[in-house]
């Protein structure tokens, strides 16, 4: 039961991480610039994201512009875009792998195979977490470097946007969730007498698992 609980917690964390990652990638709040002109009337905040930039006037009016040409974009922005999309797709793949091997599914019957699939999904989620972390940390590093560079003009300096914090949260959740999934089956699930009983059983699931591990409401 503890193992099943850890699995559920792990997958919930990774799902939360995936949603955070999606929001982080989509929101145009990676870099935030507070530009105050000579007059307070022209005060404006510029939000820069991976896909678009937005200008928020002091009046509250917001104008967003999607980046025109892919080739004209800086290489680091293109790389951040690619890594974000790849991280999200990798996490989705991890979820599919998990569903195939989850305790509450019947896609795979053999306990060993289920355990291996859950472990694999955990590793995939960890990889997704690392992939999410790279563009976020890279962008944060560039912002901080600019902040402390005396030759970068004040108007060109940026602040860490909400998307970066969401990205860090996403990465943390994916790493934690993936780690939990890896921990639920430390040795490929081949522990205890049930392993041997399953080997000589014609109906392995019925003998190797107690009915309490198969609540009918969780059948897929």
């Amino acid at each position: 039961m503890a193992s099943a609980g850890m699995q559920i917690l792990g997958v919930v964390l990774t799902l939360l991480g995936w949603v955070n990652g999606l929001v982080s990638c989509a929101l145009p709040m990676w870099k935030v610039t507070a530009f105050i002109g000579n007059s307070i009337v022209v005060a404006q905040v510029v939000w820069e994201g991976l896909w678009m930039s937005c200008v928020v006037q002091s009046t509250g009016q917001m104008q967003c512009k999607v980046y025109d040409s892919l080739l004209a974009l800086p290489q680091d922005l293109q790389a951040a875009r690619a890594l974000c999309v790849i991280a999200l797709l990798v996490a989705l793949f991890g979820l599919l792998v998990y569903l195939a091997g989850a305790k509450c599914t019947t896609c795979v019957e053999e306990k060993d195979s289920k355990a291996r699939l859950v472990l694999t999904s955990g590793i995939v989620f960890v990889i997704s977490g690392v992939l999410t972390l790279i563009p976020v940390c890279w962008t944060a590093h560039a912002i901080i470097r600019d902040f402390y560079n005396p030759l970068v003009a004040e108007a060109q300096k940026r602040e860490l946007g909400a998307s970066l914090y969401l990205g860090w949260a996403a990465s943390g959740l994916l790493l934690l969730g993936g780690g939990l999934l890896c921990c639920t089956c430390p040795s490929g699930g081949s522990q205890g007498p049930s392993h041997y009983m399953a080997r000589y059983s014609t109906s392995a699931p019925a003998i190797s698992r107690g009915p309490s591990e198969y609540p009918t409401k969780n059948y897929v």
Epitope: P74, N149, P150, L151, V152, A153
Partner: antibody, heavy 119, light 107 residues
């Protein structure tokens, strides 16, 4: 109008010291990063030092670290460069430079003051 | 230290010509590059920053571009008043270094 006027240059013997000054006017001095850049007789430009607007942070290349000291008096709108242990390779025109709110790099340059290190 | 290799060291062109000066960084400097113009007997003047952005008041015939670690300053139609020395400078990290300069003359 931004005005930067350097003074204090001249002839000095190797190992000697010199203090350059830069009088600033036409802008709010304590709002800007200030720098010194020199131009050698061979017309090469070399960054010498930079100081933050409040004077709390200073940045030097290894070639002058420990020998040159930048400081600023925001009350007097003046930038200083104290040079010691001078070498022949320090011979150059020294420019006082102001940063800008909008533009990166060295935005406004003074007319320069010549420092000659020779025995 | 990051080295800035500027070429050519001198250049002679006719009025109306398209002129390009290049600067190569010894390692990645992103877009942290500025171009300066120094007219005879004058102090240097900032032309371009962040590799492509023109300072207000600089004629639109000047333009900056970047391709990896190679940067270019282009004058689309050379004018007599463009006779000067041009320098590139990186500000990616300390120490900030300049290119050796390009002396531009009119034929």
């Amino acid at each position: 109008e931004v005005k930067l006027v350097e003074s204090g240059g001249g002839l000095v013997k190797p190992g000697g010291s010199l203090r350059l000054s830069c009088a600033a006017s036409g802008f709010t001095f304590n709002s800007y990063t200030m720098s010194w850049v020199r131009q050698t007789p061979a017309k090469r430009l070399e960054w010498v030092v930079t100081i933050s607007s409040g004077g709390g942070r200073t940045y030097y290349p290894d070639s002058v670290k420990g020998r040159f000291t930048i400081s600023r008096d925001n009350a007097r709108n003046t930038l200083y460069l104290q040079m010691s242990s001078l070498r022949a390779e320090d011979t150059a025109v020294y420019y006082c430079i102001r940063g800008d709110y909008r533009y990166d790099g060295f935005a406004y340059w003074g007319q320069g003051t010549l420092v000659t290190v020779s025995s | 230290d990051i080295q800035m290799t500027q070429s050519p060291s001198s250049l002679s062109a006719s009025v109306g010509d398209r002129v390009t000066i290049t600067c190569r960084a010894s390692e990645n400097i992103d877009s942290y590059l500025a171009w300066y113009q120094q007219k005879p007997g004058k102090s240097p003047q900032l032309l371009v920053y962040a590799s492509t952005l023109l300072v207000d008041g600089v004629p639109s015939r000047f333009s900056g571009s970047r391709s990896g670690t190679q940067f270019s300053l282009t004058i689309s139609s050379l004018q007599p008043e463009d006779v000067a020395r041009y320098y590139c400078q990186h500000y990616y990290s300390i120490p900030y270094t300049f290119g050796s300069g390009t002396k531009l003359e009119i034929k």
